[in-house]
């Protein structure tokens, strides 16, 4: 039994880090493998993660972690019974994938303006709370080509657009994701999408 693709891990910078790897053949990850992880400092405890299958030869482990600080560094040991398959380390602050934003809502009652709001996925005292920027994806359910991305580079979790920038009388969906430039994070997963029917008053044309 050998590791084909070494574990790569990302942290949500709050409570979970997720590590994924591939074995050299079909593996029952939960019965055959264990990932041990330990914060590097004196008297720290070793924790055991039981991996789950992620495709035939793929394994995934969710490592529970206390509130992350930038100095945190973990040793990782992947075991198959008594055999050490791989040894590595992981610094959560250097491999951050933010949590996905939540509660995406489209407010359609503001004078031909669409107001999209969502919730910051972090509590106020978390370091990422004030460092997230967002991308909002809006697309038409009727027309796959009607697909647009709005970059929200300010901290406020909201976006205003004129309803008239979208077609009237059809349904649209929106979703949002986040990233933090300060930690050079990857993008979060997309939030669940929300749907609305776009309609607005056409401006009165004078002849």
């Amino acid at each position: 039994m050998k590791v084909l693709q070494e574990p790569t891990c990302v942290s949500d910078y709050m409570s979970i880090s997720t590590c994924e790897w591939k074995m050299n053949g079909p593996t029952n990850c939960s019965t055959e493998l264990r990932l041990l992880y330990q914060l590097v400092f004196l008297l720290s405890e070793a924790h055991t993660c039981i991996p789950e299958n992620n495709g035939g030869a793929g394994c995934v482990c969710h490592l529970l972690m206390d509130d992350v600080v930038s100095a945190d560094n973990y040793t990782l040991d992947l075991w198959a019974g008594q055999q050490l398959l791989w040894k590595g380390s992981f610094k959560p602050s250097e491999h951050v994938k933010p949590r996905a934003p939540g509660n995406l809502t489209v407010h359609t009652n503001v004078s031909d303006t669409l107001l999209l709001t969502w919730s910051n996925p972090y509590p106020p005292r978390n370091y990422l709370y004030n460092h997230l920027t967002y991308a909002v994806n809006i697309w038409s359910e009727n027309d796959p080509a009607d697909f647009r991305i709005y970059n929200v580079t300010y901290l406020e979790p909201s976006l205003r657009i004129a309803a008239s920038t979208l077609k009237s009388g059809i349904s649209y969906r929106a979703r949002v994701r986040a990233w933090a430039q300060c930690y050079n994070t990857t993008w979060s997963e997309w939030s669940p999408s929300t749907k609305w029917h776009n309609s607005y008053r056409e401006p009165f044309e004078q002849h």
Epitope: S15, I16, L39, F41, L42, L43, S44, E45, E52, H62, L64, M65, D66, D67, V68, V69, R99, A100, G102, N103, P121, P123, P124, R125, N126, Y127, E189, S191, P192
Partner: antibody
Framework: QVQLVESGGGLVQPGGSLRLSCVAS????????MNWVRQAPGKGLEWVSY????????YYADSVKGRFTISRDNAKNSLYLQMNSLRDEDTAVYYC????????WGQGTLVTVSS | DIQMTQSPSAMSASVGDRVTITCRAS??????LAWFQQKPGKVPTRLIY???SLQSGVPSRFSGSGSGTEFTLTISSLQPEDFATYYC?????????FGQGTKVEIK
């Protein structure tokens, strides 16, 4: 081995105050965020409060906000819950529980609020 | 605040039965869900975290599934020591909230 021992519970009248303590051993307390969780007699679990190891951030359940204060003294390996303006509905066994996500619990201390 | 609704609140089952407990969140919590077991007079112990990750030392007859708002705890073959009360917990956001509990009793 990890141990959490709560104390400070007892009988108190409505409107009164009580301070609970939780002494930790078997791990580096200063490196762990901590929680208080309570359980009214015959009822379910209710999270009460959290204090971060990293930022000192504190969070409270709506039911205790403004009345309870969580704090810690890393030099004494101790977690505290100052409970003021106590009400009948605060009667419960109070547990301290360690992060991440309540991996270790103390045995609890009973707080009875009654006139 | 996020509400967690567990069902059923109580159930009777026999040794060897397959038992399923569900937990519904009032809004999306991704996989930030844990399951705890509490026996009478004892402190709770964590069985599952991150919706489906088995806590080390917990028997493999326990499993968790779900994401978003719908979650399930399954005991594949109920053992005598499994008669207890089970709670779900969301830690996606503060305040953290537990489900009201499911008591699994002997039929």
């Amino acid at each position: 081995q990890v141990q959490l021992v709560e104390s400070g519970g007892g009988l108190v009248q409505p409107g009164g105050s009580l301070r609970l303590s939780c002494v930790a051993s078997g791990f580096t307390f200063s490196h762990s965020s901590m929680n208080w969780v309570r359980q009214a007699p015959g009822k379910g679990l209710e999270w009460v409060s959290y204090i971060s190891r990293a930022t000192g951030a504190v969070y409270y359940a709506d039911s205790v906000k403004g009345r309870f204060t969580i704090s810690r003294d890393n030099a004494k390996n101790s977690l505290y819950l100052q409970m003021n303006s106590l009400r009948d509905e605060d009667t419960a066994v109070y547990y301290c529980a360690r992060e991440p996500v309540f991996d270790y619990w103390g045995q609890g201390t009973l707080v009875t609020v009654s006139s | 605040d996020i509400q967690m609704t567990q069902s059923p609140s109580a159930m009777s089952a026999s040794v060897g039965d397959r038992v399923t407990i569900t937990c519904r969140a009032s809004q999306d919590i991704s996989n930030y869900l844990a399951w705890f077991q509490q026996k009478p007079g004892k402190v709770p112990t964590r069985l599952i975290y991150a919706a489906s990750s088995l806590q080390s030392g917990v028997p493999s007859r326990f499993s968790g599934s779900g994401s978003g708002t719908e979650f399930t705890l399954t005991i594949s073959s109920l053992q005598p020591e499994d008669f207890a009360t089970y709670y779900c917990l969301q830690w996606s956001s503060y305040p953290r909230t537990f489900g009201q509990g499911t008591k699994v009793e002997i039929k």
